[in-house]
Interface confidence: low
């Protein structure tokens, strides 16, 4: 039975040209995390694999940085980066857990970050 839950940064906003950290946290399970995928709609952004480490998709290499932890840092944000992001935890033996984050990239300087996880 899948007992785990995923906590995410929820709905967040950031300024155009800036950076944002996407973070998810899997709790309430003893399952082993074998891999975490970060995806935007149907595009794969990055993977953190327990054996092979981080892999950033070639088309995002210049704007995506691994970490902190199992999170993902998006840099040089554009308005086109607005949308849904998913963290997909592949675990053994539980199976797959998915978390959702909605990012809004704003033109102005009034962007507020979500309360759960903040960029220092």
């Amino acid at each position: 039975m899948m007992t785990g839950t995923i906590e995410t940064t929820g709905n967040i906003s950031a300024e155009k040209g800036g950076s944002i950290i996407l973070q998810c946290h899997l709790s309430s399970t003893t399952a082993q995390v074998t891999q975490v995928n970060w995806e935007q709609q149907d595009q794969l952004l990055a993977i953190c694999n327990a054996d092979l480490g981080w892999h950033i998709s070639p088309s995002f290499k210049d704007r995506v940085a691994p970490g902190p932890g199992l999170g993902l840092t998006l840099q040089s944000l554009t308005v086109n980066d607005t949308g849904e992001y998913f963290c997909i935890y592949h675990t053994y033996p539980d199976g797959t857990y998915t978390g959702r984050i909605f990012l809004e990239v704003l033109e102005s300087s009034v962007a507020e970050h979500g309360a759960r996880f903040q960029i220092p």
Partner: antibody
Framework: EVQLVETGGGLIQPGRSLRLSCAAS????????MHWVRQAPGKGLEWVAV????????YYADSVKGRFTISRDNSKNTLYLQMNSLRAEDTAVYYC??????????????WGQGTTVTVSS | QSALTQPRSASGNPGQRVTISCSGS????????VNWYQQIPGTAPKLLIY???QRPSGVPDRFSGSQSGTSASLTISGLQSEDEAEYFC???????????LGGGTQLAVLG
């Protein structure tokens, strides 16, 4: 509909080369690792090779290492298997298959219908 | 010689329960979840069980998997004639960096 279609099989003489192709459709090909698996006549399944979603990580079965090369062209949604120095024991139906994950080799969740390679003089 | 060991054959009557075993080693089954594939003669294999005990959509709940230590098993309850096929277990080997496949078990449905 998620689909894999293999082509390129045929009758070939020992020592020659052959390239198999696998055309993918119905899913985001560039997000998945891909495998080649073969099955000799009347025998079980034998894993041949795997390639990661972006093509930078590849692993091979000992029986084909140094002779076969797995590659992919994500812009064409196509997987390849270049087979050199073919031997009679390479005679088999060759299947391409999708891995549910991009890097962590879990297994194969979608299979093609297979293409037959016969190595004989 | 396969790195994963399966019985060559198994059989049962319609409605019966049949279990197929698969044994491996600490470098594969001791570290990774096993998958099971079904192959009906003349057709491509089909994923039956993944991540030890998960069923893809469309696979009847008559099929179940379990795994403990370096061995795994596939159980088919309420056997049906269409279950007559060959069954393969498979697991990624972390040490050799290869996908190991069992030799296959031919299941015959009697009667």
């Amino acid at each position: 509909e998620v689909q894999l279609v293999e082509t390129g099989g045929g009758l070939i003489q020992p020592g020659r080369s052959l390239r198999l192709s696998c055309a993918a459709s119905g899913f985001t090909f560039s997000s998945y690792a891909m495998h080649w698996v073969r099955q000799a006549p009347g025998k079980g399944l034998e894993w041949v090779a795997v390639i990661s979603y972006a093509g930078e990580v590849k692993y091979y079965a000992d029986s084909v290492k140094g002779r076969f090369t797995i590659s992919r062209d994500n812009s064409k949604n196509t997987l390849y298997l270049q087979m050199n120095s073919l031997r009679a024991e390479d005679t088999a139906v060759y299947y391409c298959a999708r891995d549910p994950l991009p890097l962590h080799y879990y297994g194969m969740d979608v299979w093609g219908q297979g293409t037959t390679v016969t190595v004989s003089s | 010689q396969s790195a994963l060991t399966q019985p060559r054959s198994a059989s049962g009557n319609p409605g019966q329960r049949v279990t197929i075993s698969c044994s491996g080693s600490s470098s594969n089954m001791g570290r990774r979840p096993v998958n099971w594939y079904q192959q009906i003669p003349g057709t491509a294999p089909k994923l039956l069980i993944y991540s030890q005990n998960q069923r893809p959509s469309g696979v009847p709940d008559r099929f179940s998997g379990s795994q403990s230590g370096t061995s795994a098993s596939l159980t088919i309850s309420g056997l049906q004639s269409e279950d007559e096929a060959e069954y393969f277990c498979a697991v990624w080997d972390d040490i050799g960096r290869v996908l190991q496949l069992g030799g296959g078990t031919q299941l015959a449905v009697l009667g």
